[in-house]
């Protein structure tokens, strides 16, 4: 057993022309959330049920309102990881689908309060227990940056989380750095060590001493991008010379792009330009259908009558939206201000306010500077309901009560000695240097190398 973890780093317009308009507007603010679906294996014809390895839904991100005239920025993201627990062995190879959904605030009951902004897919090799793998995927004009990893939940260990390790009450007979494993008390498991030099970003191992490459990388240590290793023989006698006499199989040979996608080589691998309605590394993922399980909260999925409406979700009572993801409850009108949490107590609503705010609706920004002095000549600065002190020279800390050590940051260059002084710091420069921070060398003829005015 273990957990697949996905961390979204950014979602925003991709590079190049045709930047998308912000999905939110001043008239219709919105927020994002993400859904990840995992399937085992790398097979194009995977016959598994949708999300056979599991699926997860993120929290809602902060509310975003487009600034008129401004280009769409990276949009504010939900906090935390998406976690997909798996009960059985981690398969090592898996397919993923990551969907970016938009929640339109203030939409109508039963209306399309939810819409799919972007959908990316890919197939990867990944050993459990390995480091975070970083990825960038594009869907239309959008770009999603994320990291992922699989980790075993104790007592499971190993690259597939299939071996059970248990701590022993008796002193271990295993040597340093080794740990006893069940079911054999005498068996000692070494932490998995890949071949020396195996790329931590692009390689992994399932057995000690091996180095297996992630998609798009090759070479004994997985340090060579696929597209640069396609020479069967070098152009000339020197192996340092680049280019190929006989072109080897390129990454686009045989067109890996499905569903009419066109392939183009990239410095690291290849890229498929997909026709409308298809996504994924190889254009293998079509627009959302019932097979993808798009209806949440027990909604019944019915195939749509036309390609633009591939499915319709019939929602159970209490749920709304085109994907039954929105419980339209009495907190939906957002009575709590300044990030307060709305609680429905049954007879009424109550707001739990963030620090620095008060009032029934968290409408009052507490003046934390009132009655709170900053020591040693510091001045109080308000902002966001919190107070902070801007401290006078030589003091620090929340209330300027701590004496700051001006020498802590080692401000004197070129070996100069730093001395704390009541007005700040003084640098005693090493021979050959001068300046308040010993930053300027003194030339032998006596002229200093001061910057030109």
């Amino acid at each position: 057993a273990g957990v697949f973890e996905l961390q979204i780093h950014s979602f925003g317009p991709g590079p190049g022309p045709g930047a998308p308009r912000s999905p939110c507007s001043a008239r219709l603010p919105c927020r994002l959330f993400f859904r990840v679906c995992l399937k085992p294996g790398l097979s194009e014809e995977a016959a598994e049920s949708p999300c056979a390895l599991g699926a997860a839904l993120s929290a809602r991100g902060p509310v975003y309102t487009e600034q008129p005239g401004a280009p769409a920025p990276d949009l504010p993201l939900p906090d935390g990881l998406l976690q997909v627990p798996f009960r059985d062995a981690w398969p090592g190879t898996f397919s993923f689908i990551i969907e970016t959904w938009r929640e339109e605030l203030g939409d109508q009951i039963g209306g399309p309060a939810w819409s799919l902004l972007a959908r990316v897919a890919g197939r990867r090799r990944l050993a459990a227990g390995g480091p975070w793998a970083r990825d960038i995927q594009r869907a239309g004009a959008w770009e999603l940056r994320f990291s992922y990893r699989a980790r075993c939940e104790p007592p499971a260990v190993g690259t597939a989380c299939t071996r059970l390790c248990r701590p022993r009450s008796a002193p271990s007979r295993c040597g340093p750095g080794l740990r006893p494993c069940a079911p054999l008390e005498d068996e000692c498991e070494a932490p998995l060590v890949c071949r020396a030099g195996c790329s931590p970003e692009h390689g992994f191992c399932e057995q000690p001493g091996e180095c297996r490459c992630l998609e798009g990388w090759t070479g004994p240590l997985c340090t060579v991008p696929v597209s640069t290793s396609s020479c069967l023989s070098p152009r000339g006698p020197s192996s340092a010379t680049t280019g190929c006499l006989v072109p080897g199989p390129g990454p686009c040979d045989g067109n890996p792009c499905a569903n009419g996608g066109s392939c183009s080589e990239t410095p690291r691998s290849f890229e498929c330009t997909c026709p409308r309605g298809f996504y994924g590394l190889r254009c293998e993922v079509s627009g959302v259908t019932c097979a993808d399980g798009p209806c949440f909260n027990g909604g019944l999925c019915v195939g749509g009558a036309d390609p633009d409406s591939a499915y319709i979700c019939h929602c159970p009572p209490g749920f709304q939206g085109s994907n039954c993801e929105k419980r339209v409850d009495r907190c939906s009108l957002q009575p709590c201000r300044n990030g307060g949490l709305c609680l429905d107590l049954g007879h009424a609503l109550r707001c739990r306010c963030r620090a620095g705010f008060a009032g029934p609706r968290c409408e009052h920004d507490l003046d934390d500077c009132a009655g709170r002095a900053c020591a040693n000549g510091g001045t109080c600065v308000e902002g966001g309901g919190a107070h902070r002190c801007s401290c006078a020279l030589g003091f620090g800390g929340r209330d300027c009560r701590e004496r700051a050590d001006p020498c802590a940051a080692r401000p004197c260059a070129h070996g100069g000695r730093c001395y704390a002084h009541f007005s700040g710091l003084v640098c005693a420069c090493a021979p050959g240097y001068m300046g308040a921070r010993c930053e300027f060398p003194v030339h032998p003829d006596g002229a200093s190398a001061l910057p030109a005015a």
Epitope: D329, S332, Q334, A348, P360, R361
Partner: antibody
Framework: EVQLVQSGSELKKPGASVKVSCKAS????????MNWVRQAPGQGLEWMGI????????IYNHKFKGRFVLSVDKSSNTAYLQISSLKAEDTAVYYC?????????????WGQGTTVTVSS | DIQMTQSPSSLSASVGDRVTITCHAS??????MGWLQQKPGKAPKGLIY???NLEDGVPSRFSGSGSGADYTLTISSLQPEDFADYYC?????????FGGGTKVEIK
Amino acid sequence: EVQLVQSGSELKKPGASVKVSCKASGYTFTDYYMNWVRQAPGQGLEWMGIINPYSGVTIYNHKFKGRFVLSVDKSSNTAYLQISSLKAEDTAVYYCARQDSLLDYAMDYWGQGTTVTVSS
Amino acid sequence: DIQMTQSPSSLSASVGDRVTITCHASQGISGNMGWLQQKPGKAPKGLIYHGANLEDGVPSRFSGSGSGADYTLTISSLQPEDFADYYCVQYAQFPYTFGGGTKVEIK
């Protein structure tokens, strides 16, 4: 004194649009939601939707989807109901009614109503 | 949507009579309901909120009771100005819904 004063009666042709206003006074406008309720001639009351004047967030009854838009102008403490593509069956009295945003109270104060007549 | 079934749809009574109107919700609404009075040609007026609390300025002869899905409005001693239409409304869940109304007429 709490008051909700609505705009006057409207006579419109089918296909036209109308914007009914509800001006609030005597309380903090942004602390109360504004409900809109319709009453067709000789019929009961129908809830159309609700708006939070502070944020502009709205929720609509699915029956009043598409042609009906709720909005507010905080600077003038006024809530609006706009109906487009008017039909004969939109002939009714339209009421605004405030409701405490923490739902401690029901719809305690109502506007006097605006009669909208749709006829060719 | 929550259905609010109000009964009776009309009743005739005399001044001084005790009048009871009931409202049944299609599911429990935890007291999140109110009673409204509407006179001909006028806007509705709030009488009761949270099932049992009197709005400001409402005479004490009006009272509300009930819990779960069943609620009652009682006028202990009917006065001439009480002849009107009465509606229940639930605000437990969106969309809010009204009962069909009860017309209280002079016998």
